[in-house]
């Protein structure tokens, strides 16, 4: 007695798939595999399959049911902090070849990394035109101010809303200042935060306000304080620079905007007699801390002239270093003062029309605004590699 094994039914490929190998008939132990077109994946029920092969059995049936080739779905794209995502192909369409467009909140953020256009690729990932699978970044626009020019010299002016949106008030032991960098860093003077270097959480950081004592401000807290390794407390002010990392990003608006770091070309806007602007709540001519944020426009002073001014006692030789710049009037009267420490001396970059930090309020004569003496500021352009390293590492 002999029996012939039943041939199996001819396998009909599922939509968007094909059978391999193609044979006239399939008998016992013959097999076929299903391959899906690009952008489709094998699914058995709801479960994805890496591959599919069916074998013809003795009774003339296949050992596995036919799978489906289902279109790849990248799923809802991740939210973009300080940005949005738009569905371009159709509302909510997230399947193979669908296009989405990321964009950043207008005015205050700009897109970094790529153009924000992503396509759902066959691997199930949203992918940019450059092949990146990570999200783009919405970086805060820096150096925006309601003030359009530094212009002529005048002093002791009250700041108006949006004039110095990078201004940060630092409380914690003493009153000091800082300037917002990006949306989670504060640039300040090392001497202003030295005591809190191991207790960052003790720093009370306020921004988005003009009035020093106002209850209306945006609160930020420090996660870490980074003091320049070349700074020696109580031994001069060389390398008087520090960075504070905030424990949360702040929301950027017209009253809270970061200051720009100087470009390589920035020195051309910081030559002798160019005007910089210092702002803060420090001591005024009346000898009290200012209630309202004040600012003063002051010219850059020739470095040799400043060095000479601080060569005489009681100042030790070499007080003014190449890491410092000086600003003020020979006749005095316009200056930053105690309580302004750590604040930014800013300049307008006329090419980009953005304000950048050229100096950090560091030190000066015992009597602020004294004739023949000048305010001394940390020269920020010398520290760009240090700043960039800290920010990228942490």
């Amino acid at each position: 007695y002999t029996s012939t094994a039943q041939p199996c039914p001819y396998p009909m490929a599922p939509p968007n798939g094909h059978v391999s190998p193609v044979q006239a008939k399939y008998i016992l132990k013959d097999s076929f595999s299903i391959f899906c077109e690009t952008g489709y994946e094998l699914l058995q029920g709801h479960l994805p399959l890496k591959s599919f092969t069916a074998v013809c059995q003795k009774d003339g049936s296949w050992d596995r049911p036919m799978p489906a080739c289902s279109i790849v779905d990248c799923g809802p794209p991740d939210d973009l902090p300080s940005g949005r995502v738009e569905y371009i192909t159709g509302p909510g369409v997230t399947t193979y070849k669908a296009v989405i467009q990321y964009s950043c909140e207008e005015t205050f953020y700009t897109m970094k990394v790529n153009d924000g256009k992503y396509v759902c690729e066959a691997d199930g990932f949203w992918t940019s035109s450059k092949g990146e699978k990570s999200l783009p970044v919405c970086e805060p626009v820096c150096g925006l101010s309601a003030r359009t020019t530094g212009g002529r010299i005048y002093g002791g002016q009250k700041a108006k809303p949006g004039d110095f949106p990078w201004q940060v008030l630092i409380l914690g032991g003493t009153t000091a200042a800082g300037a917002l960098l990006y949306d989670n860093w504060v640039l300040t003077a090392a001497h202003a935060v030295y005591e809190q270097k191991h207790d960052a959480s003790a720093l009370d950081i306020r921004m988005g306000t003009l009035k020093r004592l106002s209850p209306h401000y945006t609160q930020a807290w420090s996660e870490a304080v980074f003091i320049h390794e070349g700074y020696t407390h109580d031994a001069g002010f060389d390398n008087d620079i520090a960075l504070i990392k905030l424990n949360n990003k702040v929301v950027i608006n017209s009253n809270i905007t970061p200051i720009c770091l100087p470009r390589k070309e920035a020195e051309s806007f910081m030559r002798t007699d160019d005007i910089g602007t210092a702002s803060g709540w420090g001591l005024t001519q009346r000898g009290f801390l200012a209630r309202n944020l004040m600012y003063v426009d002051i010219p850059i002073v020739d470095h040799q002239k400043c060095t000479a001014a601080y060569e005489k006692p009681p100042y030790p030789r070499g007080s003014v270093t190449a890491n410092m710049l000086c600003a003020g009037l020979e006749s005095g009267g316009k200056d930053s003062c105690r309580g302004d420490s750590g604040g930014a001396l800013v300049f307008l970059d006329s090419e980009t029309e953005r304000w950048f930090v050229g100096g950090i309020v560091s030190w000066g004569s015992m009597n602020c605004g004294e004739a023949g003496q000048y305010g001394v500021y940390t020269k920020v352009i010398n520290y760009i590699p240090w700043i960039e390293n800290i920010i990228s590492d942490f």
């Epitope: 289902s70 790849v72 738009e86």
Partner: antibody, heavy 116, light 111 residues
Framework: QVQLVESGGGVVQPGRSLRLSCAAS????????MHWVRQAPGKGLEWVAY????????FYVDTVKGRFTISRDNSKNTLYLQMNSLRAEDTAVYYC?????????WGQGTTVTVSS | DIQMTQSPSSLSASVGDRVTITCRAS??????????MHWFQQKPGKAPKLLIY???NLESGVPSRFSGSGSGTDFTLTISSLQPEDFATYYC?????????FGQGTKLEIK
């Protein structure tokens, strides 16, 4: 709380125009795609139009293409539907709805009657 | 356009009953990860309310007696134990492709 409030409905003659508005509150309007959906008296629901969060893309049902325009003003948190060349069959309650992947939040609707 | 066919178009039931409404799409509305099918409840004079999204996900605040299932072309909405407030019209809707389309509705009435 999240709220959508439609306005601008009314009685209008065939061939005339009307502009519907939808005021959004309680959420970041600029982060969401928005739709208009309508319901003729005693009938079912019909999707009319969609606009993406930043107005980069918009889509319409065939019966209103070329006559209706969906737009939005993110600074005013408002969605619009400009309806031109109105027909009797456009008579319906018009709802605005939020959501890119489904209609997750609806307004209470505004009634448009096209009649001579 | 994708046609959505709901059945039944109306049904009478009593409080405590288990009710199932079905919806069939004229083509598959499922991808490898999601089914683009949603269910809504509408009461007279009111706006529709989302009950179930992506075939089986219960919208926040919706009672757990509502459930959804299905994939491809065939979907069901189940109410495990009818409550007086559940008497309304129910719509299925696909968001697989534009134009988004709804079923014709199922009117659930008190027996």
């Amino acid at each position: 709380q999240v709220q959508l409030v439609e306005s601008g409905g009314g009685v209008v003659q065939p061939g005339r125009s009307l502009r519907l508005s939808c005021a959004a509150s309680g959420f970041t309007f600029s982060s969401f795609g928005m739709h208009w959906v309508r319901q003729a008296p005693g009938k079912g629901l019909e999707w009319v139009a969609y606009i993406s969060s930043g107005s980069s893309s918009s889509f319409y049902v065939d019966t209103v293409k070329g006559r209706f325009t969906i737009s939005r003003d993110n600074s005013k948190n408002t969605l619009y539907l400009q309806m031109n060349s109105l027909r009797a069959e456009d008579t319906a309650v018009y709802y605005c709805a939020r959501g890119d992947r489904n209609f997750e939040v609806w307004g209470q609707g505004t009634t448009v009657t096209v009649s001579s | 356009d994708i046609q959505m066919t709901q059945s039944p178009s109306s049904l009478s039931a009593s409080v405590g009953d288990r009710v199932t409404i079905t919806c069939r799409a004229s083509q598959s509305v499922s991808s490898s990860r999601y089914s683009y099918m949603h269910w809504f409840q509408q009461k007279p004079g009111k706006a529709p309310k989302l009950l179930i999204y992506h075939a089986s996900n219960l919208e926040s605040g919706v009672p757990s007696r509502f459930s959804g299932s299905g994939s491809g072309t065939d979907f069901t909405l189940t109410i495990s134990s009818l409550q007086p407030e559940d008497f309304a019209t129910y719509y299925c809707q696909q968001s697989w492709e534009v134009p988004w389309t709804f079923g014709q509705g199922t009117k659930l009435e008190i027996k």
